[in-house]
Structures are given as C-alpha cells and as structure tokens.
C-alpha cells in the first residue's frame, strides 16, 4: 500500500499503483509541455537501438492547484505524469500504441513512476483558520518497468518506501469535491 | 503497510523527563507529517502537537508548549516526543501519528503508556 | 480553544440498530470535523474527514455530515464490531480538539 494507504484527494491524476496514467488531452500532442524525455537518462529497456527517441517512455510536465476540502494551495504545483509505452516504435501496436503490448510469452514493459518527491504546501482556506499545510507526493521521474506475462499487477507495486503514499494525513473533505471535481480545476490550471 | 511502532511502556519520578519514539515504516517519514496525542487512563484523546520532518518545523499545543520537543532521526525513519518536567497528570497512553496534513491523523501507533509515580 | 462536545456520551444499541452521534463545536469550523473509532486497548482509527468523506476501507454502513458547529455519525446498521468508542475532532484552530468520545455498548 504505502502511500497509496493515504488518500491523495487532491492528486487523483496520479493512477494507483499498478495502474498507468494517460496525460490529459491537452497534453497529449503538446511538444511544448514535454520538457523532458526520459528525465535526461537512458531509457530502461531491453531493446538495442541507436535511437533513443524510438522510445516512448516521456515524462510530462503540468501544472496544477492542490485542492484540499474547501481548501486551496496557495501557489500551484507542477509535476509529471509517465505517458506511453516502452519499446521502440515501430515494435508498439499500431495508431497510438497505447494498447497493452505483449510479445510471446515475453516481458511487458511499462512506463511508471520511478522516483517520487514530497511537497509542502500552504493551504488557504476560507474564513480565515488557522494556517494548514499538506505534503502531496509528486512523481519525479519515470521508468520503464519490467513485467513478465505471469506476473500480476503487484509485480509493478516495487516503488519501495517512499511509494507509500501518506495520503492520509488530509483533512476530511466534502465528497462533492471527487475526482471529477479536482480533475476539472487540474484542466483549468494550464 | 504503513506501520508506526513505538518504545515500551516507561515509568518515571515527577519531574522527570520522557522520550517515546516512533518508527514509521512502509513510506518516508519526511513526507508526511508525525503527530502526538495522549489519552489520560479512561480518558479522551488530547492532541499535544504536530513535526515536519522534512524541514524540522512543528507546531505545539500551547498547553505543553517549553515542556514539549518533536524531533525525527530521518535516516532510520524515526520520531521522537520528548516531555519534560512530568507530573502525576501527565500519566497517560502517547500515541504517534501520521498523516499528509497537519490537521488530521490517519495512522497511528500502538501507543506508550508513561506513568509518572514517586 | 474550541470545544467539542459529543453526545451522548454513551448509548446502548442492538446489531443491527440504526446509531446516530452528535457533536457540537463551540464555534463554527466549517467542514473541518473528522470522525475516529476506538476499541479497547487499542489506537483510534480513521473513519471520516471532512466531515463526510469516508475513509478508504470504511464500511459505507458509516456516514458523516454537517458543516459549521453540528456534525453527525450515523451508523446505518450496527454490526458486532462496531461496538466501541467514537470520536470527534476539529482540524479548523489549533490546538486541535477532540470530543469527549461516545461509547457504544451491546444492549
């Protein structure tokens, strides 16, 4: 469980572990937002290739508010999300590669979260209480991580300590503010 | 799993001091928040204060404010509450807890008791 | 300080029973209320924050609202296990504050 035991209300963009996020809309064909490949270092991969753009492990970048309740951070947050598959191009499904790529009885490989980092926000909020923080956990870099065929899912949940994800310390919140309702303001923070 | 394990039961003179630690494991300690409340025998639940890890900042009930200190050993992913100058009502279950906001508390310890007897 | 004062502070219900605890806070605190439960010997556990959101792993037979200075924990439907103490805490002015608890006993 780790972090995912703490409940992350206002980062609900970030998948579970085992699951795998697809940027938003805007961000999909956005050149402008991917500031980084491969977070500068060499994809993890088990392909041989001169060509380190066949690879399609990316980490972008967006920018959001944290909501927290009625809550609101001060000043907004920028973090990544892990898009695209691992493998060369040209060996990913065709149109968007974004279908689950599996070779015979061979490994699958999947860009997640690598690296994680905390982040100390002020919270305000209305009528002026006392002053709030929250630490929301923000991915900071990406990998591509090995799956077998006969691995399940928790193979992925290897993240160690710090994929504990304390999203409980949060301050209870109304449940009309869901993941819809965070999802939407993320959208307006571009 | 997150788990937070705290040191054994203590008893200590009146004016006194006691340390309880508290070891969190399953996540990084520096990035949430640690939390101490006590529970008086029969008692509620008292909030003593809060500690950021990260940065080493706190903030503590003014009722044990100069009597209080909150520290953390982040290379072994260790808390400690330090209360000073015990008195007989200071007996009490301590309780760790963490959690990513200063305003609640989501896992908790299994508590320490202190008794403070002459 | 803010205080929070639960009631009753006890009350004795069948499994099964619908279990409704009030608390009431000295001063408005918006929806900052959370709601913990305690058993015997051991540490409190979460329930529900922001005065209504339920906490992950939290049979939805719990249920929390109000905002401002009252607040309520329902229990829908009592199960054997739900037999112990209930909490109310404040997380809108420090010092945070806690209710006097409400114990829930087999009847």
């Known amino acids: 469980q780790g972090w995912q035991a703490f409940k992350n209300d206002a980062t609900e963009i970030i998948p579970e572990l085992g699951e795998y996020p697809e940027p938003p809309p805007e961000l999909e064909n956005n050149k402008t937002m991917n500031r980084a490949e491969n977070g500068g270092r060499p994809p993890h991969h088990p392909f041989e290739t001169k060509d380190v753009s066949e690879y399609s492990c990316r980490e972008l970048h967006f920018t959001r508010y944290v909501t927290d309740g009625q809550c609101r951070s001060a000043k907004p947050v920028t973090e990544l999300v892990c898009s695209g598959q691992c493998g060369p191009a040209r060996l990913l499904p065709n149109a968007i590669g974004r279908g689950k790529w599996w070779r015979p009885s061979g490994p699958d490989f999947r860009c997640i979260p690598d690296r994680y980092r905390a982040q100390r926000v002020q919270l305000l909020c209305p009528g002026g209480a006392a002053p709030r923080a929250r630490k929301v956990r923000l991915v900071a870099s990406c990998k591509c991580k090995r799956l077998t065929r006969f691995h399940n899912q928790s193979e992925l949940k290897d993240f160690g300590p710090e994929a504990a994800r304390p999203q409980k310390g949060r301050k209870p919140r109304p449940r009309a503010r869901g993941a819809k309702a965070n999802q939407a303001e993320l959208e307006n923070a571009y | 799993q997150v788990q937070l394990v705290q040191s054994g039961a203590e008893v200590k003179k009146p004016g006194a001091s006691v340390k309880v630690s508290c070891k969190v494991s399953?996540?990084?300690?520096?990035?949430?928040?640690m939390h101490w409340v006590r529970q008086a025998p029969g008692k509620g639940l008292e909030w003593m204060g809060w500690s950021d890890p990260e940065i080493g900042d706190h903030e503590y009930a003014s009722k044990f404010q100069g009597r209080v200190t909150m520290t953390e050993d982040t290379s072994t992913d260790t808390a400690y509450m330090e209360l000073s100058s015990l008195r007989s009502e200071d007996t009490a279950v301590y309780y760790c807890?963490?959690?990513?906001?200063?305003?609640?508390?989501?896992?908790w310890g299994q508590g320490t008791l202190v008794t403070v007897s002459s | 300080d803010i205080q929070m004062t639960q009631s009753p502070s006890s009350l004795s219900a069948s499994v099964g029973d619908r279990v409704t605890i009030t608390c009431r806070a000295s001063?408005?605190?918006?929806?900052?209320l959370a709601w913990y439960q305690q058993k015997p010997g051991k540490a409190p556990k979460l329930l529900i924050y922001?005065?209504?959101t339920l906490e992950s792993g939290v049979p939805s037979r719990f249920s929390g609202s109000g905002s401002g200075t009252d607040f309520t924990l329902t229990i829908s439907s009592l199960q054997p296990e739900d037999f112990a103490t209930y909490y109310c805490q404040q997380g809108d002015t420090l010092p945070y504050t806690f209710g006097g608890g409400t114990k829930v006993e087999i009847k």
């Open positions: 001063e408005g605190i918006h929806d900052a």
């Open positions: 807890a963490t959690g990513d906001t200063t305003y609640k508390f989501d896992y």
């Open positions: 922001w005065a209504s």
């Open positions: 399953g996540y990084t300690l520096t990035h949430t928040f």
